[in-house]
């Protein structure tokens, strides 16, 4: 079967070659071809080109933010690991360590706190935050984790939020929050994770991580 397919492919390739050669001869005005033949071949070729171009335009309309396939649309993905920080800031710190992913320079970890993308498109963005808290030692307010976005020239905003009440376990009870969603990001957009009490975040291997993937 495979042999027959190969012969078929070769025959088609030969026909394409003859067709292209004929167009070339028409263009150079060779006398061996009648004018009628040339006109017919040319209009056939123009039809093919038109179909290809129309098809390309339709694809462009349907996927206005998508790049063409192949090298122009490389995989963009990042997965970073939590890093304990001496800073009292509510923005979590991350590092490229352990089993991390940073696909290429189209996504970067900036200042250890935010993932920044260079290409516009739809991204799945996620974060897992594990924290250890105790009801008595904590304030009445729940532990809240927020996934935030900063786009060039626009106000900072929250994309996703999740809250957990504090555990009654002593000295503290471990709980995990998972955030994830699909968002359109503009070039230069940065995403980061905010928590109400960074001192309660667990930084043990695999407990707290953050990442994104361009769809």
């Amino acid at each position: 079967h495979r042999r027959l397919d190969k012969i078929e492919d070769e025959r088609n390739l030969h026909e394409d070659f003859v067709f292209m050669k004929t167009i070339q001869r028409c263009n150079t005005g060779e006398r061996s071809l009648s004018l009628l033949n040339c006109e017919e071949i040319k209009s056939q070729f123009e039809g093919f080109v038109k179909d290809i171009m129309l098809n390309k335009e339709e694809t462009k309309k349907e996927n206005s933010f998508e790049m063409q396939k192949g090298d122009q649309n490389p995989q963009i993905a990042a997965h970073v690991i939590s890093e304990a920080s001496s800073k009292t800031t509510s923005v979590l710190q991350w590092a490229e360590k352990g089993y991390y992913t940073m696909s290429n320079n189209l996504v970067t970890l900036e200042n250890g706190k935010q993932l920044t993308v260079k290409r516009q498109g739809l991204y799945y963005i996620y974060a897992q935050v594990t924290f250890c808290s105790n009801r008595e030692a904590s304030s009445q307010a729940p532990f809240i984790a927020s996934l935030c976005l900063k786009s060039p020239g626009r106000f900072e905003r929250i994309l996703l939020r999740a809250a957990n009440t504090h555990s009654s376990a002593k000295p503290c009870g471990q709980q995990s929050i998972h955030l994830g969603g699909v968002f359109e990001l503009q070039p230069g957009a940065s995403v980061f994770v905010n928590v109400t009490d960074p001192s309660q975040v667990s930084h043990g291997t695999g407990f707290t991580s953050f990442g994104l993937l361009k769809l």
């Epitope: 927020s146 020239g153 626009r154 106000f155 905003r157 929250i158 939020r161 359109e184």
Partner: antibody, heavy 122, light 106 residues
């Protein structure tokens, strides 16, 4: 139906502090899909953005006013406030509070209060 | 600081089409929106994201942006469209309004 209502003194003496409050009804000021802002309009003139605040307390101000403007939020009362100290006659304007809708690609003010005229005069 | 420039006034006869322009440096790279303000009333958004119309805004209002200019077009202008129109854009975390255009329906 979302409604915004400005309140505060209509007359403020020069060098004093202008204080206004906007009470929001029909929506939660804690919602993270909006910012809440102040825009002013001097009599017979155009619109002038003062600043905006988020439910988290994050603020953005007009650079020309940044040094003296403060916007704060009280989620328990569903209100946000504007404080502008050391006022002069140039601060006389109709002050509007508005909701800034946050879209995927752009943001705009979709609901406005009816405005309150604040006159700076001794 | 960033500036948006609008003509101070524009006039039109009822039923005619009128365009109000707003120009600013690299405005084509930003998104523009338009507000209508009738005398003694609060502004109302009529166009956002260059050409999107909020629900409740008549189809005769349309917007476009090209190069350094954003344009608000009102086709089949009615007497009720007489108002001040303000364009608005964003520049590095700052909300910028144009000076406004007074539209007079003759």
């Amino acid at each position: 139906q979302v409604q915004l209502q400005e309140s505060g003194p209509g007359l403020v003496k020069p060098s004093e502090t202008l204080s206004l409050t906007c009470t929001v009804s029909g929506d939660s000021i804690s919602s993270f899909i909006y910012y809440w802002g102040w825009i002013r309009q001097p009599p017979g003139k155009g619109l002038d953005w003062v600043g905006c605040i988020y439910s988290s307390g994050g603020t953005y101000y007009n650079p020309s006013l940044k040094s003296r403007v403060t916007i704060s939020v009280d989620t328990s009362k569903n209100q946000f406030s504007l404080k502008l100290p050391s006022v002069t006659a140039a601060d006389t304007a109709v002050y509007y509070c508005a909701r800034l809708w946050l879209g995927t690609t752009t943001d705009y003010f979709d609901y406005w209060g009816q405005g309150t005229l604040v006159t700076v005069s001794s | 600081s960033y500036e948006l420039t609008q003509p101070p006034s524009v006039s039109v006869s009822p039923g005619q089409t009128v365009s109000i322009t707003c120009s600013g440096d690299k405005l084509g790279d930003k998104f523009a929106c338009w507000y209508q303000q009738k005398p003694g009333q609060s502004p109302v958004v009529v166009i956002y994201q260059d050409d999107k119309r909020p629900s409740g805004i008549p189809e005769r209002f349309s917007g476009s942006t090209s190069g350094n200019t954003a344009t608000l077009t009102i086709s089949g202008t009615q007497a009720m469209d007489e108002a001040d129109y303000y364009c608005q854009a964003w520049d590095s975390n700052t909300v910028v309004f144009g000076g406004g255009t007074k539209l007079t329906v003759l």
